[in-house]
Amino acid sequence: GILNLNKMVKQVTGKMPILSYWPYGCHCGLGGRGQPKDATDWCCQTHDCCYDHLKTQGCSIYKDYYRYNFSQGNIHCSDKGSWCEQQLCACDKEVAFCLKRNLDTYQKRLRFYWRPHCRGQTPGC
């Protein structure tokens, strides 16, 4: 769920998600439209697709709470719990490390980006 994602992103990137990523660009945070603005925004767009896939699989992406371990900078998704919980963890792990990989191109000007400026084709999944 959202609490899992926030905690994981903070652990991996060192940034407070609520201040740095939710929202950011055209796809980080709730919803998403238009062409992603940069690599960080692409991370979120890919994550949206991951969640969309799980939704089609009947998973409660915002409610499901999963177990994971964070140690020595790595995330280990627990093999405990349901299929949905394990897949949800995998989606969140991927976006957390994607955001970390792209910290060097993070742009403060894209925080709280005005969504009506998000134009162009929304990438498909």
Partner: antibody, heavy 119, light 106 residues
Framework: QVTLKESGPGILQSSQTLSLTCSFS??????????VSWIRQPSGKGLEWLAH???????RYNPSLKSRLTISKDTSRNQVFLKITGVDTADTATYYC???????????WGHGTTLTVSS | QIVLTQSPAIMSASPGEKVTISCSAS?????MYWYQQKPGSSPKPWIY???NLASGVPARFSGSGSGTSYSLTIGSMEAEDAATYYC?????????FGGGTRLEIK
């Protein structure tokens, strides 16, 4: 060879607390990935998952019964316990413990212990 | 929670007849598990991950399905197959079982 055996009081009065024990052999609940579940079956009816406990003492409960259930383990004695508070006649059933492996199903089952709750 | 509905609830089949038991999920699941239970005994794992037979299960059994629709099939009914069959999911929490299908021999 994995075996599980349930034991319980057999008969209880309404409002009493049910204490069940699952004694097992052939595996260790300290081994990563191991998980023991409790499942019940009212006579002539279907199966209902109640709770499970993992090797690392993580616990999960059926949301509809969560407030009444407590699962615990004694790894050194190869036992898992289940307590159900405030039983009533609807809790009359056969109670099974089962080993859930790394997959999403229940791999080994005990023979079950029958509980009758009288009002 | 995901509700599993089995059909039919009770059925009978003649020796040699093909039998299909259905399990319908209230929302999509990734895998289905099946158990066989005979009177006075505990459930036995029968089919795991939708289509894989558990150890010792005769090859006349098969499992299939995806999404919300799954089935267990017996290619040629035998007397020893008379039992109750349950489907089960742990796609999402909590794990749930179907209500069972009682299969009798004619």
């Amino acid at each position: 060879q994995v075996t599980l055996k349930e034991s319980g009081p057999g008969i209880l009065q309404s409002s009493q607390t049910l204490s069940l024990t699952c004694s097992f052999s052939g595996f260790s609940l300290s081994t990563s990935g191991m998980c023991v579940s409790w499942i019940r079956q009212p006579s002539g009816k279907g199966l209902e998952w109640l709770a499970h406990i993992y090797w690392d003492d993580d616990k999960r409960y059926n949301p509809s019964l969560k407030s009444r259930l407590t699962i615990s383990k004694d790894t050194s004695r190869n036992q898992v316990f289940l307590k159900i508070t405030g039983v009533d006649t609807a809790d009359t059933a056969t109670y099974y413990c089962a080993l859930k492996g790394r997959d999403y199903g229940f791999d080994y089952w005990g023979h079950g212990t029958t509980l009758t709750v009288s009002s | 929670q995901i509700v599993l509905t089995q059909s039919p609830a009770i059925m009978s089949a003649s020796p040699g007849e093909k039998v299909t038991i259905s399990c319908s999920a209230s929302s999509s699941v990734s895998y289905m598990y099946w158990y066989q239970q005979k009177p006075g005994s505990s459930p036995k794992p029968w089919i795991y991950r939708t289509s894989n037979l558990a150890s010792g299960v005769p090859a006349r059994f098969s499992g299939s399905g995806s999404g919300t629709s799954y089935s267990l099939t017996i290619g040629s009914m035998e007397a020893e197959d008379a039992a109750t069959y349950y489907c089960q999911q742990y796609h999402s929490y909590p794990p749930t079982f179907g209500g069972g299908t009682r299969l009798e021999i004619k």
